[in-house]
């Protein structure tokens, strides 16, 4: 069998949801000594980076300016050390937002409920879309989908204090082109004192784990680079729609 290098890790810096005309940054974390990185889009080569000097850093950032629906979709990356290519990374779904219109998000019976009550979110958008998405801030990888002509409902079932937080919804024109976000709706779930004090606190920043962890090489890193890279690939779980 043909020998290949370990697959790189692809990440979106800050967020995979990029407002139209803004810049997306995708990181491909490969290996020290890589002479070329390739970014692939929907299975075709999109862009090439050749680090200078190659041996000093374990990855590259691909900046995608002027985000639009033609640049939204599934990305992956590969890298090369000498003549040896890596396996392909996992797929990353890059979404363009702020397309067309703004939906309205509401919650029933209301934004303040007690633990155990059944809660339903409603997302409404009058323009032509059939898929709606509900995201909890700080948890934007956990996208809930629902379908409807102008409105979709998101039944949450009996809620707990873990459901507390700020929610937004989007209308989706296809898997990778979303509307402007709705205004946030803050859900407050009151429960008994023990539950409340133990409730997890959401981070206030989105996708805090999606930062580009590119490092410059040191002697120790050089020795551990391959082992470390393999370990990261093993533990990294990536988002798929």
């Amino acid at each position: 069998p043909k020998q290949t290098l370990p697959k790189p890790i692809i990440r979106a810096e800050s967020t995979y949801m990029v407002p139209k005309e803004k810049q997306a940054t995708l990181c491909c974390q490969g290996s020290y000594g890589a002479v070329e990185y390739q970014l692939h889009f929907e299975g075709s080569l999109f862009a090439v980076e050749r680090p200078k000097p190659p041996e000093r850093i374990n990855g590259v950032k691909f900046h995608i300016p002027d985000m639009n629906s033609r640049k939204a979709g599934r990305y992956s990356c590969i890298y090369r050390v000498g003549e040896l290519w890596s396996e392909r990374s996992d797929l990353l779904d890059l979404v363009v937002t702020e397309m067309y219109d703004t939906p309205t998000l509401s919650v029933h019976p209301g934004p303040e409920v007690t633990s155990g009550e059944k809660v339903t979110f409603y997302c409404r958008l009058d323009t032509a879309t059939s898929m709606f998405l509900l995201l909890k801030e700080g948890r934007s990888r956990d996208v809930q989908r629902s379908y409807g002509k102008v409105q979709a409902e998101f039944p949450m079932g009996p809620v707990t204090t873990a459901h507390r937080g700020s929610y937004r919804c989007f209308g989706s024109y296809n898997n990778y082109a979303w509307s402007f976000p709705s205004e946030p709706v803050k859900l407050l779930v009151t429960g008994d004192i023990e539950n409340t004090s133990l409730a997890p606190t959401d981070p206030t920043f989105p996708d805090s784990w999606d930062t580009c962890l590119l490092t410059r090489e040191t002697g120790l890193q050089k020795d551990l680079a391959l082992w470390d890279h393999t370990a990261q690939n093993h533990h990294h779980h990536h988002h798929h729609h």
């Epitope: 999109f46 862009a47 980076e49 950032k61």
Partner: nanobody, 127 residues
Framework: QVQLVESGGGLVQAGGSLRLSCAAS????????MGWFRQAPGKERDFVAA????????YYADSVKGRFTISRVNAKNTVYLQMNSVNPGDTAVYYC????????????????????WGQGTQVTVSS
Amino acid sequence: QVQLVESGGGLVQAGGSLRLSCAASGRSFSRYAMGWFRQAPGKERDFVAAISSSGDPTYYADSVKGRFTISRVNAKNTVYLQMNSVNPGDTAVYYCAAGLTARDTTVVVHPNGYSYWGQGTQVTVSS
């Protein structure tokens, strides 16, 4: 806004050479990665060659590697495609494209990465 105008196309014999030029009007030419694509009748538009905004690196389709050379002169707002050892398979309309990049070492290969396109220049290779 960038306007692109290709020139230099024409009829050439197999084995001959041709140099295409693409003149850009508008500001900040040196911030744009540039590429050449071609489209033969009834076929899709194919990538030919690309160059980063700084001029290095460059990237070529396998079918033209070693025969074609892409270059740019930022002071003249112009990108060139030097075509050597042409063959009938190189017959097509050649398009120049410009795409903004945030790094001067990025080469853009996919057509969706380009925002601006020229009208094209016809290249015909006779055998």
